[in-house]
C-alpha cells in the first residue's frame, strides 16, 4: 500500500496545494529510494518548468516525468515531450502555455525507468506557482514641485498582478518599500530636490487570480534627483 | 462542456440600475476566478471586471470603478454584476468568462444593455 507524506511547499491552502506519494520502505533496496522532489513554476503563464536535483540520485539516472490533470477532461496521462538536462541528465521537463490548465489539479510523476515501482506522484495547483516577468518600462512624472508618479509595464493582465515598489536615496542604508494594487501606480508625495532617488519594481500573481508567494525579478532601476537633467521638470525615466 | 448564460441586462434611462447574472455549468465554477467584459457596438471587447475563485478579491475597469459591483455565489454556480448610475457609454453587451479574462475562453451569448439619455 503506498503511503502519502503531505508536504508543505510554502502556499498552502484550505486543500493541499502539495501531496507527496512514495513506495513504501519495507527494505532499502534501491526501488525504495526516496525520488527528489519536483518543483514546478509557471512563467508569465507563458512556459511551466517542473525541475528536480538530479545529482541526489546514487548514480546517474534519467528519471522520466509524466503527467496529468486530476478530475479534469485533461485527466488522460501525458508524457514529458521536451527534458531539461543537467550534464546530460535529465533534471526537468518544459511544459508549453496548452499544457498549463492554471486552475485544475496538476498531477506530476516522476519515476525511474529501470525500477518502474520506484515512483513519487505530486499534486500542484499551478495558479500558486505563477512567476510573472518584471515589471518594464518604469517612467516618472513630476506631479507638483514635491511630488513624484512612478508608472510601469507588465508583461502580464495588470488586474492580476500586485507589486512590490522599493526606493531609497543615496544617504540611505535601506530601502523603504510600499505594496501596490493592480492599479500599478505609485507617488512619492514629499521628494527632496537635493538628492538622488533610485526606484524599481517586482511583480507578483496575487491575488485575483492566483496565491503566489513568489515574486518576479526586480525591474531595472530608475533614477530620478540631483544628477539628472534639469531640461525637462516634467519626465524622466532614466534606467542604469 | 462550459456553458455560461447571461441574463438581467435591459434597457434604462443614465443613473439607473440593473444587475446582471451569470449562470455556470461544466467545470468546476469555485475552482476559477471568473470575469466581466463587455463590447459596445463597433469596438472590441473591453474587460470590466475579475472577482477571484473564492469572491476574496475584486478588480475593476477604471471606467466602472465605484459605480459597478462584481461578486459570485459559488453554491449556486453564478456570477453577478451590479451596475449603479449607468452612463450612455456603458451601452455594450455583456459577457461573463471563466477565469481572470485572457481572451482565450470562449464567451456565453452575452446579454444587452442599453442606457439611454
Known amino acids: 500500500l503506498n503511503t502519502t507524506i503531505l508536504t508543505p511547499n510554502g502556499n498552502e491552502d484550505t486543500t493541499a496545494d502539495f501531496f507527496l506519494t512514495t513506495m513504501p520502505t519495507d527494505s532499502l533496496s534501491v526501488s525504495t529510494l526516496p525520488l527528489p522532489e519536483v518543483q514546478c513554476f509557471v512563467f508569465n503563464v507563458e512556459y511551466m518548468n517542473c525541475t528536480w536535483n538530479s545529482s541526489s540520485e546514487p548514480q546517474p539516472t534519467n528519471l522520466t516525468l509524466h503527467y496529468w490533470y486530476k478530475n479534469s477532461d485533461n485527466d488522460k496521462v501525458q508524457k514529458c515531450s521536451h527534458y531539461l538536462f543537467s550534464e546530460e541528465i535529465t533534471s526537468g521537463c518544459q511544459l508549453q502555455k496548452k499544457e498549463i490548465h492554471l486552475y485544475q489539479t496538476f498531477v506530476v510523476q516522476l519515476q525511474d525507468p529501470r525500477e518502474p515501482r520506484r515512483q513519487a506522484t505530486q499534486m500542484l495547483k499551478l495558479q500558486n506557482l505563477v512567476i510573472p516577468w518584471a515589471p518594464e518600462n518604469l517612467t516618472l512624472h513630476k506631479l507638483s514641485e514635491s511630488q513624484l508618479e512612478l508608472n510601469w509595464n507588465n508583461r502580464f493582465l495588470n488586474h492580476c498582478l500586485e507589486h512590490l515598489v522599493q526606493y531609497r536615496t543615496d544617504w540611505d542604508h535601506s530601502w523603504t518599500e510600499q505594496s501596490v494594487d493592480y492599479r500599478h501606480k505609485f507617488s512619492l508625495p514629499s521628494v527632496d530636490g537635493q538628492k538622488r532617488y533610485t526606484f524599481r519594481v517586482r511583480s507578483r500573481f496575487n491575488p485575483l487570480c492566483g496565491s503566489a508567494q513568489h515574486w518576479s525579478e526586480w525591474s531595472h532601476p530608475i533614477h530620478w534627483g540631483s544628477n539628472t537633467s534639469k531640461e525637462n521638470p516634467f519626465l524622466f525615466a532614466l534606467e542604469a | 462542456q462550459v456553458q455560461l448564460q447571461e441574463s438581467g441586462g435591459g434597457s434604462v434611462p443614465a443613473g439607473g440600475s440593473l444587475k446582471l447574472s451569470c449562470a455556470a455549468s461544466?467545470?468546476?465554477?469555485?475552482?476559477?476566478?471568473m470575469t466581466w467584459a463587455r463590447q459596445a457596438p463597433g469596438k472590441g471587447l473591453e474587460w470590466v471586471s475579475t472577482?477571484?475563485?473564492?469572491?476574496?478579491?475584486?478588480a475593476y475597469a477604471a471606467s466602472v470603478e465605484g459605480r459597478f459591483t462584481i461578486s459570485r455565489d459559488n453554491a449556486k454556480s453564478t456570477l453577478y454584476l451590479q451596475l449603479n448610475s449607468l452612463k450612455t457609454e456603458d451601452t455594450a453587451m455583456y459577457y461573463c468568462?471563466?477565469?481572470?479574462?485572457?481572451?482565450?475562453?470562449?464567451p456565453g451569448q452575452g446579454t444587452q444593455v442599453t442606457v439611454s439619455s
Open positions: 461544466g467545470f468546476s465554477f469555485s475552482s476559477y476566478p
Open positions: 468568462t471563466k477565469g481572470y479574462g485572457d481572451g482565450t475562453p470562449a
Open positions: 472577482i477571484a475563485s473564492d469572491g476574496g478579491s475584486t
